[in-house]
């Protein structure tokens, strides 16, 4: 058992079928010695007396808030949570794995830039009863401060006949480097209650392998005289990190007809122009990606041919 | 070229061979996860190798003041990494194919290093730790780890001479 | 995720062509080579040659040498397969695998397969 | 060419039991040699490299041995869905090779 915060306790169980569960000893914050008695919930019903109780914890039944009386005066509360253990891994109910870049991903990170501040998201199908906790630090030894924000609500859709909820923070790193070589990698912990249920997750990476560009800004066509070829000009996205000499971009300029299954013409360029053909009823796209580095490309910036 | 003294590296020369070295570095390792084998662990492998860190004036503002410094640790990184890719870890078993990325890489990291400092001056540089796996899955993960690590350090370089070219050529 | 997609099922007159096609997608294609594998009905499995989409480097195996071409778009990110002349010892599910460019590997990601039927 | 001989061809056993698969390879090859499974209609799906390194998501019951010319597939206390054939497949020198193959039943 351990304190997640103030009078909220995690029992850690292992899960299985007749399992002996973890003997828990509750001491009542009171200086009182006597006539003490002990509630679990909104139950009227005394589990003991005294400063101490002492209770087998082998089911969500078993946990909840305890609190200590005396008189019908509140002196405590003690709340159990419970993290369930089956063969030898802890559980992930709370949250939906998202299977993208691999599977058992349940935490999903993105940063527009090297500024130190990032974006991580995740899914769940649970609407009500839900809090999450986000922690954040450069490395785990020695751990370099990153404040996270409030985890908020930031989506909701309908997946066949379930809704997903999307739950998003935002962290920024306490002393951030943006032109260093990152040697240690950000660590984010999300703690998840669900009711009674209390599981954590993790997710650990260097912001160079998340960086996702937002797309190229101000994308423009000007025809060139006597010619189908067109000349397409954009600029850096306003969130890209700057000198731009320093940090710079790659970009791939893409014509795409107006059926899917025509066949695209892509160019890449370092530079923020480029000459192509315009067809009739295309489309021209760019997006942007680190010249240096190859994570993410950014979505793409779009404008109609005509 | 960077000589100790303290005169002007080719800057552009620099740019086109760091922006080659980027995309060697991501032919050798292209994918996380595309060969993923089990045993990666995290014990520390390629915690010995030369970070470009905070203090070492690879920042737009340091190279301005002064690019020595921010060049020095490059060169350092540099040879460092050439002694690890012509290491039993790169020539051993599964052995590299002649025409192969890596071998490039190998080359080019080499010739980066001769740009930044001619025959006959010195810096300092690091040794390289002594690791000599045995099974051929062990070199394998630490040729992934050292090419993942190396592609983060050849980024930062490239990006130097990228403004070193665009803002510090004569 | 990465992954490789073949080309439909083939049934060819023997001396005819087929050319069977797989496209790659979830990594950059000229950082990897395919090899190409086929195995006969009921029968184990036969490596026919590679080509590195790095350089365009190929490399036939000796039981199809002369009767095979492979190639890249990499503007699709598409290796082809083209198989002359077949006979009915051709009969055969082709398989394309990511093949590494620096140094001779294991072949962890596999197409499908296309089933080629040569009958006359 | 690298000729790899598989034994047995063909093998019948029961759950729980405890499967070795050997492959010999006519010349040295180090430990360039891999093993797959492959299930009917299916791809086959790399379970070992390079002798003994084990893939992420193959199941830890799958084990490899050996260097030089003699390799071992071990499959420790097997299951119903290990029903298949298994190849192993040498990448030390062109052109590639593979075993003939070891079919699997489950009794």
């Known amino acids: 058992i351990w304190e997640l915060k103030k009078d909220v306790y995690v029992v850690e169980l292992d899960w299985y079928p007749d399992a002996p569960g973890e003997m828990v000893v509750l001491t009542c914050d009171t200086p009182e010695e006597d006539g003490i008695t002990w509630t679990l919930d909104q139950s009227s019903e005394v589990l003991g007396s005294g400063k101490t109780l002492t209770i087998q914890v082998k089911e969500f039944g078993d946990a909840g808030q305890y609190t200590c009386h005396k008189g019908g005066e509140v002196l405590s509360h003690s709340l159990l949570l419970l993290h369930k253990k089956e063969d030898g891994i802890w559980s992930t109910d709370i949250l939906k794995d998202q299977k993208e870049p691999k599977n058992k991903t349940f935490l999903r990170c993105e940063a527009k830039n090297y500024s130190g501040r990032f974006t991580c998201w995740w899914l769940t199908t649970i609407s009500t009863d839900l809090t999450f906790s986000v922690k954040s630090s450069r490395g785990s030894s020695d751990p370099q401060g990153v404040t996270c924000g409030a985890a908020t609500l930031s989506a909701e859709r309908v997946r066949g006949d379930n809704k997903e909820y999307e739950y998003s923070v935002e962290c920024q790193e306490d002393s951030a480097c943006p032109a260093a070589e990152e040697s240690l990698p950000i660590e984010v912990m999300v703690d998840a209650v669900h009711k009674l249920k209390y599981e954590n997750y993790t997710s650990s990476f260097f912001i160079r392998d998340i960086i996702k560009p937002d797309p190229p800004k101000n994308l423009q066509l000007k025809p060139l005289k006597n010619s189908r070829q067109v000349e397409v000009s954009w600029e850096y996205p306003d969130t890209w990190s700057t000198p731009h000499s320093y940090f710079s971009l790659t970009f791939c300029v893409q014509v795409q007809g107006k059926s899917k299954r025509e066949k695209k013409d892509r160019v890449f360029t370092d530079k923020t122009s480029a000459t192509v053909i315009c067809r009739k009823n295309a489309s021209i796209s760019v997006r942007a990606q680190d010249r240096y580095y190859s994570s993410s490309w950014s979505e793409w910036a779009s404008v109609p041919c005509s | 070229r960077a000589v100790p003294g303290g005169s002007s590296p080719a800057w552009t020369q620099c740019q086109q061979l760091s922006q080659k070295l980027c995309t060697l570095a991501w032919s050798a390792h292209p994918l996380v996860g595309h060969m993923d084998l089990r045993e990666e662990g995290d014990e520390e492998t390629t915690n010995d190798v030369p970070h470009i860190q905070c203090g070492d004036g690879c920042d737009p503002q340091g190279l301005r003041d002064n690019s020595q410094f921010c060049l020095q640790r490059i060169h350092q990184g540099l040879i460092f990494y050439e002694k690890l890719l012509g290491s039993d870890i790169f020539t051993g078993e599964p052995s590299l194919l002649p025409d192969s990325p890596v071998g490039q890489l190998h080359a080019s990291l080499l010739g980066l290093s001769q740009l930044l400092q001619p025959e006959g001056h010195h810096w300092e540089t690091q040794q390289i730790p002594s690791l000599s796996p045995s099974q051929p899955w062990q070199r394998l993960l630490l040729r992934f780890k050292i090419l993942r690590s190396l592609q983060a350090f050849v980024a930062v370089a490239a990006r130097v001479f990228a403004h070193g070219a665009a803002t510090l050529s004569p | 995720q990465v992954q490789l997609v073949q080309s439909g099922a083939e049934v060819k007159k023997p001396g005819a062509s087929v050319k069977v096609s797989c496209k790659t997608s979830?990594?950059?294609?000229?950082?990897?080579?395919i090899s190409w594998v086929r195995q006969a009905p009921g029968q184990g499995l036969e490596w026919m040659g590679l080509i590195s989409a790095y350089n365009g480097n190929t490399n036939y195996g000796q039981k199809v040498q002369g009767r095979v071409t492979m190639t890249t778009d990499t503007s699709t990110s598409t290796a082809y397969m083209e198989l002359r002349s077949l006979r009915s010892d051709d009969t055969a599910v082709y398989y394309c695998?990511?093949?590494?460019?620096?140094?001779?590997?294991?072949?962890?990601?596999w197409g499908q397969g296309t089933m080629v039927t040569v009958s006359s | 060419e690298i000729v790899l001989t598989q034994s047995p061809d063909f093998q019948s056993v029961t759950p729980k039991e405890k499967v070795t698969i050997t492959c010999r390879a006519s010349?040295?090859?180090?430990?360039?040699l891999h093993w797959y499974q492959q299930k009917p209609d299916q791809s086959p799906k790399l379970l070992i490299k390079?002798?003994?390194q084990s893939i992420s998501g193959v199941p830890s019951r799958f084990s490899g041995s050996g260097s030089g010319t003699d390799f071992t597939l071990t499959i420790n206390s097997l299951e119903a869905e290990d029903a298949a054939a298994y190849y192993c497949?040498?990448?030390?020198?062109?052109?590639?090779?593979f075993g003939q193959g070891t079919k699997l039943e489950i009794k």
């Open positions: 497949h040498q990448s030390s020198s062109l052109p590639y090779t």
């Open positions: 979830g990594y950059t294609f000229t950082y990897y080579g």
């Open positions: 695998v990511t093949e590494n460019i620096n140094w001779r590997d294991a072949f962890d990601i």
């Open positions: 010349q040295t090859i180090g430990s360039s």
């Open positions: 390079y002798a003994s």
